[in-house]
Interface confidence: low
């Protein structure tokens, strides 16, 4: 079914490489999608010996792997960079690693901020 305008969703935005890439470091990102495409949020991070290092957060375009996920949960066992995606405004604020094979769940919830909206 078509629609007259691009859908919007809002996600938490973060870029650890903001200086080099000349972007904002953090805030809110308003996602804009193509006609009939779903919109998601994502988070990516590294885990060095239990220390969480946030890499990026933001909008993620239509991806079946993200459909109907209310929580941002990474399921890969031990990747170099963890990745999760989800549907729902700001659903990428908190993110979790929960390997499909089982094991402990690790949830990271950054301190809330009052970010500025990225346009």
């Amino acid at each position: 079914s078509g629609r007259g305008e691009a859908e919007t969703r809002e996600c938490i935005y973060y870029n650890a490489n903001w200086e080099l890439e000349r972007t904002n470091q953090s805030g809110l990102e308003r996602c804009e999608g193509e006609q009939d495409k779903r919109l998601h949020c994502y988070a990516s991070w590294r885990n060095s010996s239990g220390t969480i290092e946030l890499v990026k957060k933001g909008c993620w375009l239509d991806d079946f792997n993200c459909y109907d996920r209310q929580e941002c949960v990474a399921t890969e066992e031990n990747p170099q960079v963890y990745f999760c995606c989800c549907e729902g405004n700001f659903c990428n604020e908190r993110f979790t690693h929960l390997p499909e094979a089982g094991g402990p769940e690790v949830t990271y919830e950054p301190p809330p901020t009052a970010p500025t909206l990225l346009t």
Partner: antibody, heavy 116, light 107 residues
């Protein structure tokens, strides 16, 4: 223009049933979580149910659990609330609303009166 | 379940006044909080989400702050159209819950 248009309210006897409908327009319905909220006369807002965008995840308030059923038909662009075993305390204005982290679009409200 | 407590339940103020409404959650909800305005006979209107982010089209005199358990909605300079009832809502976990409301009346 994004909006939600509700239908299905009315007067019903205790123990009776009623189905509310909510028709979205101006946005892609299947991308959004939807909720029902009610407001008893002179009282505050009470969230009663939420359904995820594809209908997989459904939640209810304890006050309606087992009696009310939320559902959606993304092909027909419709949200429903089936209300069974209605009680006097279910008398309220019922609203459908879009979203979860902030309900940004609301229906106009429909009045349900449960009385003998 | 998370309970939301709003205070005061009502207040009287004049046009131009600074108005502050508080909302307390029974347990930590990070910044998963929304504020709504409702006028008699009308559906609620979203003002603020994520505790402090202004909804598109809402005047900048409205602001939200707080995280964890204590939250504040501030109207910096009350306008005639702001006389209404205001509700907070936690969206951290189900069942979602609203505060009892704060009615802002004309002094």
């Amino acid at each position: 223009q994004m909006q939600l248009v509700q239908s299905g309210g009315g007067l019903v006897k205790p123990g009776g049933s009623l189905r509310l409908s909510c028709a979205p327009s101006g946005f892609t319905f299947r991308d959004y979580h939807m909720s029902w909220i009610r407001q008893a006369p002179g009282k505050g807002l009470e969230w009663i149910s939420n359904i995820s965008n594809s209908g997989t995840n459904i939640y209810y308030a304890d006050s309606v659990k087992g009696r009310f059923t939320i559902s959606r038909d993304n092909a027909k662009n419709s949200l429903y609330l089936q209300m069974n075993s209605l009680r006097a305390e279910d008398t309220a204005v019922y609203y459908c609303a879009r979203g979860h982290y902030g309900m940004d679009i609301w229906g106009q409200g429909t009045t349900i009166t449960v009385s003998s | 379940d998370i309970q939301m407590t709003q205070s005061p339940s009502s207040l009287s103020a004049s046009v131009g006044d600074r108005v502050t409404i508080t909302c307390r959650a029974s347990q930590g909800i990070a910044n998963y909080l929304a504020w709504y305005q409702q006028k008699p006979g009308k559906a609620p209107k979203l003002l603020i989400y994520a505790a402090s982010t202004l909804q598109s089209g809402v005047p900048s005199r409205f602001s939200g702050s707080g995280s964890g358990t204590d939250f504040t909605l501030t109207i910096s300079s009350l306008q005639p159209e702001d006389f209404a009832t205001y509700y907070c809502q936690q969206v951290k976990s189900y069942p979602l819950s609203f505060g009892g409301g704060t009615k802002v009346e004309i002094k």
